[in-house]
Structure formats: C-alpha cells, structure tokens
C-alpha cells in the first residue's frame, strides 16, 4: 500500500484584497486516520488556519464536503483577503493518536500573495 | 440544546415499506453527516445507514442494502429511512443520531418501533 | 466484528475498565451508555477519548493500537448500565459496535 501523500498543486496563488482564496490540497489515501489541519508558516510560530475537527474558523470554508466518507479533498477557502493574510500556507495530515494527534506529514506549502484592491 | 426525534414507527406486515423521520433542531443540521442506528428486542446496536451533509452520498449496511433508502431535507432540518421489504429481522428501536467528524455518533435520538409481523 | 466482555462488575468507588478490540489501526471508537434496552443511547466517549461536555469526568477513554479503553474512576450506582464499544473503519465506510458489556454495581 502507498503511503499517503499531501498533495498541494499550486506552489503560488496571488489574491487582490477583499477576494477569496482557494487553496488546493488532495490526500492520496484516508489512511492513516486522522485530521488535516491547515497552517500559515512553519516551525513552533505557525499560525493555526483551519482544524478539521474542532474550532470556530468563520473566514474559512472547506471547498469539497468533508462529511463524505470517501473524501480525499481539503481545499480551503479562505474570504474577506487582506494583506496581512500574506504567506505560505501548509495542508498538514496528523496520525490519530491518544492523548495527542501527531503531524504525519505536510504538503510543500503554497504560498498566497495579496494585490491591491482595484481603483 | 441539540435534539433529535424520530417519528414514523409503526406495525407492519412482512413486505410491507415504512418511512421513518427524525427531525432536528438545536444545530445547524445542514453542517453535518447523519445515521440511522436500530436495536433488536434483546439484541445490541446495530448501524443501518449514513448520509453525507448535503445528501449527496449514502452508505448502508449489507444487511439492508438494496432494500432501504436514506434521504434528508436540509430546508426541513429531517433525515428520513425508506425501508421496504419489510421482514422480521427488521423489528427494532431505529435511533436517528449525528454523526461527528471522524463518522462516529455525538447524539441520539429517543427512537422509534418498528415491528414487522403477520 | 469488535468484542468487548460480555460483563464486568464493581463495588462503588472502584475503577472499572472495559476493553474493545479488533476494530483495526484504521478505525476511530467511541463508546456508548444505554440504562435499559430500547432507552436511547448517550455518547460517553468518541474520536477514542473525547468527551462531550455534559459527561461526567470520571468516564475516560483511550486508544493503544487496535483497542480502545473505557475507564470509569470511581464508578457509581447509576453508571449501572449497557456500555457499547462502536467504530468506524475508514476503508470500508462502515459502523460497527460491540455486543455491549453489561456493568453491575455491587
């Protein structure tokens, strides 16, 4: 068997203020068990984006139906751009694990560039 | 306060279909996955069917596959059962209960009867 | 199929544990209180040892492997009950549960 894969196809999106941005990021496999989270930036500052299962996150929605019990897609959503969202954006796959998950592995990143609002 | 009630039990004759209810409230019912769940006089938990949050994909157990039919109306807050062919081996208690992230169960119905007898 | 003891029994005050198996490294459980047949079911434990908020924190679950651990510290009269291990199995999209463990409180 294969191991999963996080697949994040765009290495760049670049948003104009005030839009919403799509980031894109695919498993390979539902196994193992266990959320996905997304973050921006890397390392012990990373700022927490979207946990699959627990938190209040209302700029964020998942693009596919993550209730599906075959779905393999986590692409975000994220509205109401503003330059401050700037950086690189990370889909992280966890293992289940009691009493904490642990990171499994991450897509390469994707890194969101903000426009100016057109005049 | 999240609650669920199912309605639409009933006695039936073998062969017979029966529809089943349960109507939501306290919660965005739209936002999540949902299953039915029955029990046999004396007999444990047994997992009939699920549906996604949308309604789009359904999921059934083998043992009423091909003879059951499950459904939601988001715009009504109620997930239904659609059960035919009815035989003994469907008298159960059918809990209605929502599913969490990971398609496990957060809350539950009170349920409802169904017997099946000639 | 995943087995749990058919039965377990305790004094008030004790620790009981109850054991599920067999649902696979690619399984979550949770774990389920009914006080008598045909009541309905109350979620004491999912995603292996969350507990929902309105439930006591003497119930604790966990999960080692291809078992899951309910653990009830300090059980009490009215923890009398049916306890129902449950999981899903993500490859292949199904609900399982256990026989149920009946708990007696001596």
């Known amino acids: 068997e294969d191991e999963l894969q996080v697949i994040q196809p765009e290495k760049s999106v670049s948003v104009a203020a005030g839009e919403s941005a799509t980031l894109r990021c695919a498993m390979t496999s539902l196994i193992p068990v266990g959320p996905i989270m997304w973050f921006r930036g890397a390392g012990a500052g990373r700022e927490l984006i979207y946990n699959q299962k627990e938190g209040h996150f209302p700029r964020v929605t998942t693009v596919s139906e993550l209730t599906k019990r075959n779905n393999l897609d986590f692409s975000i959503s994220i509205s109401n751009i503003t330059p401050a969202d700037a950086g690189t954006y990370y889909c992280v796959k966890f293992r289940k694990g009691s009493p904490d998950d642990v990171e499994f592995k991450s897509g390469a990143g994707t890194e969101l560039s903000v426009r100016a609002k057109p005049s | 306060d999240v609650q669920l009630v199912e309605s639409g039990g009933a006695v039936v004759r073998p062969g017979e279909t029966l529809r089943l209810s349960c109507t939501a409230s306290g919660f965005t019912f739209s936002s999540y996955a949902m299953s039915w769940v029955r029990q046999a006089p004396g007999k444990g938990l047994e997992w009939v069917s699920g549906?996604?949050?949308?309604?789009?994909?359904?999921y059934y157990a083998d043992s009423v596959k091909g003879r059951s039919t499950i459904s939601r109306d988001n715009s009504k807050n109620t997930l239904y059962l659609r059960m035919s062919s009815l035989t003994a081996e469907d008298t159960a208690v059918y809990y209605c209960?929502?599913?969490?992230?990971?398609?496990?169960?957060?809350?539950w119905g009170l349920g409802t009867l169904v017997t099946v007898s000639s | 199929a995943l087995t749990q003891p058919a039965s377990v029994s305790a004094n008030p005050g004790e620790t009981v544990k109850i054991t599920c198996s067999g649902g696979g490294t690619s399984s979550y459980y949770g774990w389920y209180q009914q006080k008598s047949p045909g009541s309905a079911p109350v979620t004491l434990i999912h995603s292996d040892d969350k507990r929902p908020s309105d439930i006591p924190s003497r119930f604790s679950g966990s999960a080692s492997g291809s078992t899951a651990t309910l653990t009830i510290t300090g059980v009490q009269v009215e923890d009398e009950a049916v306890y129902y291990c449950?999981?899903?199995?993500?490859?292949?999209?199904?609900?399982?549960f256990g026989a149920g463990t009946t708990l007696t409180v001596l």
């Open positions: 209960a929502r599913e969490t992230w990971n398609h496990l169960f957060d809350y």
């Open positions: 549906i996604s949050a949308s309604g789009s994909d359904t």
């Open positions: 449950g999981g899903y199995d993500y490859t292949t999209y199904v609900n399982t």
